[in-house]
């Protein structure tokens, strides 16, 4: 009597939604064994836990496979929302960037955050800085007290996306000229200008003098 009751009771469980895809199922614990290719998933509801058989694993779980044994295992990667395997994340929690199966609050060096997908993509790769160039001003290396020196670096690898900016590839800084005065009397344009002004002034002065002399002579002749 008791056994027959248990058997009919068990048979009725098959219609229970949690018994879908099960090879063995009970009212209290749900599925204990799944049909081939389905994933066993231990669903937890407060203190209660029961087995289910699923075609694919829910968010936060991945399909853990052993020969003829499939199970939904929890993603254990920090800040990961869904993963492909034990140690490879495919989607991070909000505010974290996905990079090589892991989740970061900021992208590692050499990688740039792509906000629309929240992934770290290869940034713009630049080479090493060159040595500082010669101190110059107006393409001259003498004749001034201060000038600018420049150094550059090459873009080794262009970024994966055009929207990702490259870091600066040239920078300049103020420097002191090696020679303030140019050798061989060569003067700077400013010095030349000063000299020309002086000349001009002298010419005007001389012209004015000559004009004064001319006026005086003219009066005398009258």
């Amino acid at each position: 009597q008791g056994n027959r009751w248990r058997r009919s009771k068990r048979a009725s469980y098959v219609s229970n939604p949690i018994c879908k895809g099960c090879l063995s199922c009970s009212k209290d614990n749900g599925c204990s064994r799944c049909q081939q290719k389905l994933f066993f998933f231990l669903r937890r509801e407060g203190m209660r836990q029961y087995g289910e058989c699923l075609h694919s694993c829910p968010s936060g779980y991945y399909g853990h496979r052993a020969p003829d044994m499939n199970r939904c295992a929890r993603c254990r990667i920090e800040n990961c929302d869904s993963c492909f395997s034990k140690d490879f994340c495919t989607k991070c929690k909000v505010g974290f960037y996905l990079h090589r199966g892991r989740c970061f609050d900021e992208c590692p060096d050499g990688f740039a955050p792509l906000e629309e997908t929240m992934e770290c993509v290869e940034g713009c790769e630049v080479g090493h800085w060159s040595e500082w160039g010669t101190c110059s001003r107006n393409n001259r290396t003498c004749g001034f007290k201060w000038g600018l020196e420049t150094r550059t670096r090459q873009i080794v690898k262009k970024p994966a996306k055009d929207t990702i900016p490259c870091p600066t590839i040239a920078e300049s800084r103020r420097c002191k000229m090696a020679m303030r005065h140019c050798p061989g009397g060569k003067r700077t344009p400013k010095a030349k200008e000063k000299r020309n002004k002086k000349k001009k002034r002298k010419l005007i002065e001389r012209a004015q003098e000559q004009h004064s002399v001319f006026l005086a002579t003219d009066r005398a002749n009258q």
Epitope: R33, F40, P67
Partner: antibody, heavy 119, light 107 residues
Framework: EVQLQESGPSLVKPSQTLSLTCSVT????????WSWIRKFPGNKLEFMGY???????YYIPSLKSRVSITRDTSKNQYYLQLNSVTTEDTATYYC?????????????WGQGTLVTVSS | DIKMTQSPSSMYASLGERVTITCKAS??????LSWFQQKPGKSPKTLIY???RLIDGVPSRFSGSGSGQDYSLTINSLEYEDMGIYYC?????????FGAGTRLEIK
Amino acid sequence: EVQLQESGPSLVKPSQTLSLTCSVTGDSITSGYWSWIRKFPGNKLEFMGYISFSGKTYYIPSLKSRVSITRDTSKNQYYLQLNSVTTEDTATYYCATYHGYGGPWFAYWGQGTLVTVSS
Amino acid sequence: DIKMTQSPSSMYASLGERVTITCKASQDIDSYLSWFQQKPGKSPKTLIYLTNRLIDGVPSRFSGSGSGQDYSLTINSLEYEDMGIYYCLQYDEFPVTFGAGTRLEIK
């Protein structure tokens, strides 16, 4: 009632092959997972691997190169072969079964057979 | 492989006493833990699976609890027939691994 029974030689010489049989009654080996477990003299238990209902096998990495689990469904028996044995393989060998993640693991065990590796 | 650290390795307890054996996994094993009892000359017997589910026929004085990496087996009121070696087993990940065992003896 599911019953498992191990059988095979109790003494094996070093470098030889250890061969054991597990005879199953009360259940079919075409259902569930059928494994081998051994217990070393210091009481340490080690799971060695299993053969599934479809005949697929899993072996622990440390034994993969020298272990083999096979079956004969007509006899409802499965077998363990461990090659190139050393004295370190001296242990009590058990066959045991389980039916999936949601059920009890190794719910049924054989009584165990002690295998000594010695020249 | 996941390492299961069981403690104590051996213990003496009095009849009627409450006994607790613990198992710590080297990583989160998501409740995939079983407890076994082995008596001298016998094969191991499953007591508990999935952390806290008692096998039919196992006395209710046995109970299991835990989550993440830490699990325990409690015998509420120790009886003479409870002496033996107790093992934990993780089956969260292959290869499944056992604890080293706890030898329980009656004082």
